[in-house]
Amino acid sequence: SGTTNTVAAYNLTWKSTNFKTILEWEPKPVNQVYTVQISTKSGDWKSKCFYTTDTECDLTDEIVKDVNQTYLARVFSYPAGNVESTGSAGEPLYENSPEFTPYLETNLGQPTIQSFEQVGTKVNVTVEDERTLVRRNNTFLSLRDVFGKDLIYTLYYWKSSSSGKKTAKTNTNEFLIDVDKGENYCFSVQAVIPSRTVNRKSTDSPVECMGQEKGEFRE
């Protein structure tokens, strides 16, 4: 059904990292425009990105209201310049997105090593607690604020002079590891949510090595 000069959107895909969430779809419009609606399973539809020629819509503001909810979106197609026109069934063509639960599915962004400090044969490594767009009481929550203990970090570390990697894990954003005196080490971290079935791990952080700017050494 639908007017002869509109086609339904397809390949609706959620692209979400640290709760920054964009719905993407195809095709690039030819003589048509799109409007997106989003809803929770039990809620009302809310329209976003009205009559756009883009093939993406930022839905972050909606999903951060409750990241534990499951959301559904749909993309309506309208003839360009005649957005009141409807299909033969009395409403414009539309396509539904897959369901999306931000807490369970948003990708974990690449973490960053904030600092490392050596004291004797111990090195304290701190992971930056990245701010998200999730708000509570008018403040933006960090990744740790949102995920709590569901989020762990894995540290990979190795002597600059060798390739043998060791690992440590933490339920906080800090590590305290033993190192050999006089040796320089390199570090990389990864965010992990072990309880997840999808998108469990982030990509590895950029490698940081002792003897470079970010660290600090104390006897």
């Epitope: 540290l155 440590a168 339920n171 309880s195």
Partner: antibody, heavy 125, light 108 residues
């Protein structure tokens, strides 16, 4: 040092909501620890109910999740437990506890190191 | 959920004797998340051991923990009168966090 004190009614009628508050003294509830509720049925073992972070992030025992709400009030340095639709099976000693990070094996992990004295809640008409 | 089974249910010993308490998990538990608690009548539990083997500050060195995977042990090398209590193992790695059923160490 940090101390915890549970408060709330000792008697709750069946089908009503059990409400308890835990007051944290000697430290800030916003200082990077988690705050838990645990209960112990008469003469029995311990059952974890759930936990909350100062940000409001919660984790609940799935067996109780549909009836449990844990909330935090940072301005009062308190966190609270609500358990709805109670029955006699909810009669227990209810404890609040602090879940604090301890160093182990290169990282930090959380353990319940400070507990309240516990408060007995009886569900009866 | 991870079920923790403690044995024996009751251990009858005399002061000065060695107590060995077992905690077996229904599936593998990361040692980082395994703790032991002591509870005396009318009191709240007290953290003794964390990370399966690390003593909490102020806990006497007669208490020691060991084990990995599914089998963990709490050992009290020489029982003192104040050690007679109920001991619980707990895992805090997988929700729901679970406790064992407890082992009561009583005076023989």
């Amino acid at each position: 040092q940090v101390q915890l004190q549970e408060s709330g009614p000792g008697l709750v009628k069946p089908s009503q909501t059990l409400s308890l508050t835990c007051t944290v003294s000697g430290g800030s509830i916003s200082s990077g620890q988690y705050w838990s509720w645990i209960r112990q049925h008469p003469g029995k073992g311990l059952e974890w109910i759930g936990e909350i972070y100062y940000s409001g992030s919660t984790r609940y025992n799935p067996s109780l999740k549909s009836r449990v709400t844990i909330s935090v009030d940072t301005s009062k340095n308190q966190f609270s437990l609500k358990l709805s639709s109670v029955t006699a099976a909810d009669t227990a000693v209810y404890y609040c506890a602090r879940d604090a990070p301890y160093y182990y094996g290169g990282g930090y992990y959380y353990y319940m190191d400070v507990w309240g004295k516990g408060t007995t809640v009886t569900v009866s008409s | 959920e991870i079920v923790l089974t403690q044995s024996p249910g009751t251990l009858s010993l005399s002061p000065g004797e060695r107590a060995t308490l077992s905690c077996r998990a229904s599936e593998s538990v990361d040692s980082s998340y395994l703790a032991w608690y002591q509870q005396k009548p009318g009191q709240a539990p007290r953290l003794l051991i964390y990370g399966a083997s690390t003593r909490q500050t102020g806990i006497p060195d007669r208490f020691s923990g060991s084990g990995s995977g599914t089998d963990f042990t709490l050992t009290i090398s020489r029982l003192e009168p104040e050690d007679f209590a109920v001991y619980y193992c707990q895992q805090a790695g997988v929700v729901p966090y679970t406790f064992g059923g407890g082992t009561k160490v009583e005076i023989k």
